[in-house]
């Protein structure tokens, strides 16, 4: 949400998700102000004493930063004057999930907005033809997911068919004991058909497509974050 009106500026945040062990971005924009030295950006997290990050007078001020964020945060300093208060977060952890507030003060006024930050793991699936199997089968693998996702298969030819009886899905814990590798095998596949492997949890949905013909194998995969936006 944003606050507007006299002496208030509009601040907009976007609900987003962080992939654990990677960089994350907490998105926040505000009405630009060419006077960089007059801009104050504060990021706060619900339940945490101290600040997540503070930027003022054209530079970072970490004097009130909570220890769990030390060395892990930065604003995009060159984009602050154009109204970008987004925060870069290093090495996202499960514990980084929660409600954050982006607070802005400029020469035009002040405003704030909250965002819900979800953390988990999500990755692109890769589908390959499994020639080792007794019958032609497809193997769908995705290296990192958390929480445990659901896996479903679909086919262009047999739309609406339930493949749960002819598929086998396993989840293997990765070395850091949080995320899991997803492996799903679909048996008795036919050529000249397009199959889709869909992996989904409450953070992301990923789909891998494979088209097998006599002459070639075509693959495509995509990943979308769920509930992302203002």
């Amino acid at each position: 949400f944003g606050i507007s009106g006299k002496h208030f500026i509009t601040v907009t945040t976007f609900t987003s998700a962080g992939n654990i062990g990677e960089d994350g971005t907490l998105s926040c924009t505000f009405e630009p102000d060419i006077k960089l030295n007059g801009i104050v950006i504060q990021w706060l997290k619900e339940g945490i004493k101290g600040l997540v990050h503070e930027f003022k007078e054209g530079k970072d001020d970490l004097s009130q930063q909570h220890e769990m964020f030390r060395g892990r945060t930065a604003v995009f300093a060159d984009q602050v004057v154009v109204g970008n208060a987004s925060l870069r977060l290093k090495n996202v952890q499960l514990t980084d999930a929660g409600t954050y507030t982006c607070y802005i003060r400029t020469s035009k006024g002040k405003g704030n907005a909250n965002l819900e930050y979800k953390t988990g793991a999500f990755s692109m699936p890769e589908i390959n033809v499994d020639y080792n199997a007794s019958s032609e089968s497809l193997r769908c693998e995705a290296p990192r997911w958390f929480p445990q996702p659901t896996v479903a298969w679909a086919s262009q030819v047999d739309q609406g068919a339930n493949f749960s009886e002819v598929s086998n899905t396993s989840f293997e814990l990765n070395s850091e004991n949080v995320t899991m590798k997803v492996v799903s095998v679909l048996y008795n596949v036919t050529i000249n058909n397009t199959y889709s492997c869909m992996i989904e949890n409450d953070i992301a949905k990923a789909t891998g497509d494979i088209k097998v013909t006599d002459s070639e194998v075509k693959r495509r995969s995509q990943l979308q974050l769920l509930n992302s936006g203002p």
Partner: antibody
Amino acid sequence: EVQLVQSGAEVKKPGASVKVSCKASGYTFTSYWIGWVRQAPGQGLEWIGDIYPGGGYTNYNEKFKGRATLTRDTSTSTAYLELSSLRSEDTAVYYCARLDGSSYRGAMDSWGQGTLVTVSS
Amino acid sequence: DIQMTQSPSSLSASVGDRVTITCKASQGFNKYVAWYQQKPGKAPKLLIYYTSTLQPGVPSRFSGSGSGRDYTLTISSLQPEDFATYYCLQYGNLLYAFGQGTKVEIK
């Protein structure tokens, strides 16, 4: 252009202390972490620790805790490494390096020329 | 603390060869692995960070990849100026750690 200029070579006796300086220019000194790395003759790189000049916050390799002290002087844009209770195995080239990513501790992207510290009786 | 085990410790190769150096992290997952090149008497030079991002000015024959605990530096076609020692660095955690180094020598 980012530049890190280190102090000259030092020869010290076992048990003594040494203070190596690293003067930064070409960027806002208080906005980037500065790391320290050493390299013994013919050996690999060893991370000692780092400091955020904007607040004086530090991180240390367990191996050097209690013996290494990282400080900074923001008025001269200079970072310091002091190593006490020197022994012969501390003979090494000591490097300072700026960490990429400003207040975010990134990889070391710009390096000083190195300072040779020799510990010998 | 995370340790980085680098291999091989040395290798001999010829100009034009494809060279692969690996680093294995002792635990955990994060993408914060960087690769450095060091020549005798010189400071290390950053080649790659965040597993696969090429530092500006570094030739495209250098590439990085990896996930989980295993990370790789590849030189697609070794050039005369590439004979040097290479180090990986883990910088995702509070405590940073270098690999032991790989010396690339002329065969």
